[in-house]
Amino acid sequence: EEELQVIQPDKSVSVAAGESAILHCTVTSLIPVGPIQWFRGAGPARELIYNQKEGHFPRVTTVSESTKRENMDFSISISNITPADAGTYYCVKFRKGSPDTEFKSGAGTELSVRAKPS
């Protein structure tokens, strides 16, 4: 069976301050079982943007019903974008465990923030 891939089709997205940004992510397999997390940046300084499993992420909504077991679309919308939101966003698949372990990351989508039109 082909190994799961994390696909982020957009290399970059540009959004005006105050608007919402949609970041696309799909996976190619339901295996291994485990949650998706979104991060801004890579490495130890990365910021957790969304965790499918736990936490409250008020500016983030999932584009599809990510809680459905057969779902493979983990795209998100981030509302009320500010300059501090600019950066590269990674959709990351985790393998279920205690604790969950990182399995595979998407290639990233760079979000740039334009000045709010006056």
């Epitope: 301050a17 105050g18 801004r40 940046g41 490495g43 130890p44 300084a45 990365r46 910021e47 957790l48 943007i49 965790n51 736990e54 936490g55 409250h56 992420f57 008020p58 500016r59 983030v60 009320n80 500010t82 300059p83 501090a84 939101d85 709010k116």
Partner: antibody
């Protein structure tokens, strides 16, 4: 209910060190960035430091850079502030504060820990 | 760095008399402004976020408005328990996170 409880405050001499702790409960601690904010006697609020949810990303106010170190232990739901080379002007009540999300305001505050630096 | 200037420094009002507090940013912060209340001897408490949204459990006599650089916190009918210092906080540009200098509200 979200609870943040600071401990470790006290009286120290200039040049000495102190470590503050903030015990968190009532929320998924490992999912949120955390901050330290201080308030000198009779003064306003001054942001001191921030740490991201995983603990690998930190930011500091210029006034404490190189002297203070923020850290966290997500397995213990605890936030720390290691304060070295303390100065009289570091005398303040130190509050830990939870962020609403990674790029946002502070939605919950601890009760504070008093740090007094005096010779 | 964005500087937040609050005015007036002190505001004295009678119970039931509208109180209006101002916070001005040195550059636009969009709607990314919060208000915190700090009563004497207590920790700060979040009142308003995103300029106009009341935090959980905050009475509706507190309201926030504004965007860009000029923001207002209004206490429509102040109660004696509203005596406190009120701080604005911006989170549009960071670090550092910035607070205003505070407005002390006294209820006569």
């Amino acid at each position: 209910d979200v609870q943040l409880v600071e401990s470790g405050g006290g009286v120290v001499r200039p040049g000495e060190s102190l470590r503050l702790s903030c015990a968190a409960s009532g929320f998924s601690f490992r999912s949120y960035a955390m901050n330290w904010v201080r308030q000198a006697p009779g003064e306003g609020l001054e942001w001191v430091s921030r740490i991201n949810s995983g603990g690998g990303g930190t930011d500091y106010a210029d006034s404490v850079k190189g002297r203070f170190t923020i850290s966290r232990d997500n397995s213990k739901n605890t936030l720390y502030l290691q304060m070295n080379s303390l100065r009289a002007e570091d005398t303040a009540v130190y509050y830990c504060a939870k962020q609403y999300d990674w790029n946002s305001f502070f939605d919950y505050w601890g009760l504070g820990a008093l740090v007094t630096v005096s010779s | 760095e964005t500087v937040l200037t609050q005015s007036p420094a002190t505001l004295s009002v009678s119970p039931g008399e509208r109180a209006t507090l101002s916070c001005r940013a040195s550059q636009t912060v969009g709607s990314k402004l919060a208000w915190h209340q700090q009563k004497p001897g207590q920790a700060p408490r979040l009142l308003i976020y995103d300029a106009s949204n009341r935090a959980t459990g905050i009475p509706d006599r507190f309201s926030g408005s504004g965007s860009g650089t000029d923001f207002t916190l209004t206490i429509s009918s102040p109660q004696t328990e509203d005596s406190a210092v009120y701080y604005c906080q911006q989170y549009y540009y960071w670090p550092p996170y910035r607070f205003g200098g505070g407005t002390k509200v006294e209820i006569k």
